[in-house]
Interface confidence: medium
């Protein structure tokens, strides 16, 4: 839109654009006269002065009460109220490189950076965070303890969407064939607990065995799954008759 302060447009008096051009493309200044570089996020926009141009596509000019701290506004003695370009879409988006960007504008910036290095452009695959298969953040640890003790295994997993966590007991018959038993089954000395967190898209699960019996010895598997895949980690519970039977160093992570 034209401003009262604009006056007649004299293209010959327009300042030259940088020789290499503008990463976000060209637009016209606030008077609609001179070509200027399109403004990016956090850059000044609007106003009648020549050179105070319009925002790049996907951005809008918004009045800000703050000065541009440490940026050009404050340095140039700009006004207390400043209009800056902000991204219209302020929600996360998933890039074709599998990285989640806080906004479409940041994805576009990353894409232009990649292209400038001779790499492939990054495109938006979907709105929202990128989906990813589960991975085990903290696997369960092997446990050695005596009959009658109270023991627990814990497992922390992450994935997008948030994974579903289950526990299996791994059994091997005499011929070595492996099969799994979904826990807790009908065991009354065994409890399963799951909670969300501690971080976003994480789940933590526990198996509590109390009292511990010889039949509880074996391999326990924490299994996480979502629409993107699955992951699992296992730990052994070894049951002994007396504490002195527990080796002092039974591999890293072995605990009572």
């Amino acid at each position: 839109s034209s401003s009262d302060a604009c006056g007649p447009c004299v293209p010959a008096s327009c300042p030259a654009l940088p020789r290499l051009g503008c990463p976000l493309g060209e637009t016209r200044d606030a008077c609609g006269c001179c070509p200027v570089c399109a403004r990016g996020e956090g850059e000044p926009c609007g106003g009648g002065a020549a050179g105070r141009g319009h925002c790049a596509p996907g951005m809008e000019c918004v009045k800000s009460r703050k000065r541009r701290k440490g940026k050009a506004g404050a340095a140039a003695g700009g006004p207390a109220t400043l209009a800056v370009c902000v991204c219209k879409s302020r929600y996360p988006v998933c890039g074709s490189n599998g990285i989640t960007y806080p906004s479409g504008c940041q994805l576009r910036a990353a894409s232009l950076r990649a292209e400038s290095r001779g790499e492939k452009a990054i495109t938006q695959v979907s709105k929202g965070t990128c989906e990813q298969g589960p991975s085990i953040v903290t696997p369960p640890k092997d446990i050695w303890n005596v009959t009658g003790a109270k023991v627990f295994l814990s497992c922390e997993v992450i994935g997008i969407p948030t994974p579903v966590l289950i526990w299996n007991k791994v059994k091997r018959d005499h011929s070595g064939v492996q099969r799994t038993e979904l826990l807790p089954g009908d065991r009354e000395n065994l409890a399963i607990q799951t909670r969300g967190g501690p971080e976003k898209h994480e789940v933590t699960g526990w198996v509590l065995v109390s009292p511990l019996s010889k039949e509880d010895a074996g391999e326990y598997e924490c299994h996480a799954s979502n629409s993107q895949g699955q992951a699992s980690a296992a730990a052994k519970i070894t049951v002994v008759d007396a504490l002195h039977e527990i080796p002092l160093k039974k591999g890293e992570g072995a605990q009572l």
């Epitope: 654009l17 976000l24 990016g40 850059e43 050009a72 290095r117």
Partner: nanobody, 128 residues
Framework: SVQLQESGGGLVQTGGSLRLSCAAS??????????MGWFRHAPGKEREFLTA????????YYTDSVKGRSTISRDNAKNTVYLQLNNLKPEDTAVYYC???????????????????WGQGTQVTVSS
């Protein structure tokens, strides 16, 4: 006044790497208000523009002579711009200069006359 000080140059073998730094200082100099560029000057040749980065660090530009084997970056908190040079060749031997241009907007500057402040340069020698 504004000072730009390059460092990180030296003697390197063909195929080697170097990371050049350019530290900016000066009273009332707001580093994050400046677009930065790297140039080089080889004996008997004109000063050659290599790469540029916008004030925010969001956008970068590389000429064909260094594209794919160099990375420009900046740390506005440290008032420093960097140039990582990989797979160096004997023809990369030159004095490397950084330069600063006041710019409130995302724009690239490539000509010597567009830049306001220059460093003293750091020598890079690539031996075969």
């Amino acid at each position: 006044s504004v000072q730009l000080q390059e460092s990180g140059g030296g003697l390197v073998q063909t195929g080697g790497s170097l990371r050049l730094s350019c530290a900016a200082s000066g009273r009332s100099f707001t580093f994050s208000s400046y677009a930065m560029g790297w140039f080089r000057h080889a004996p008997g040749k004109e000063r050659e523009f290599l790469t540029a980065i916008t004030w925010s660090g969001d956008y970068t530009y590389y000429t064909d002579s260094v594209k794919g084997r160099s990375t420009i970056s900046r740390d506005n908190a440290k008032n420093t711009v960097y140039l990582q040079l990989n797979n160096l060749k004997p023809e990369d031997t030159a004095v490397y200069y950084c330069a600063a241009k006041f710019s409130q907007v995302s724009a690239f500057f490539a000509t010597v006359s567009e830049y306001e402040y220059w460093g003293q340069g750091t020598q890079v020698t690539v031996s075969s």
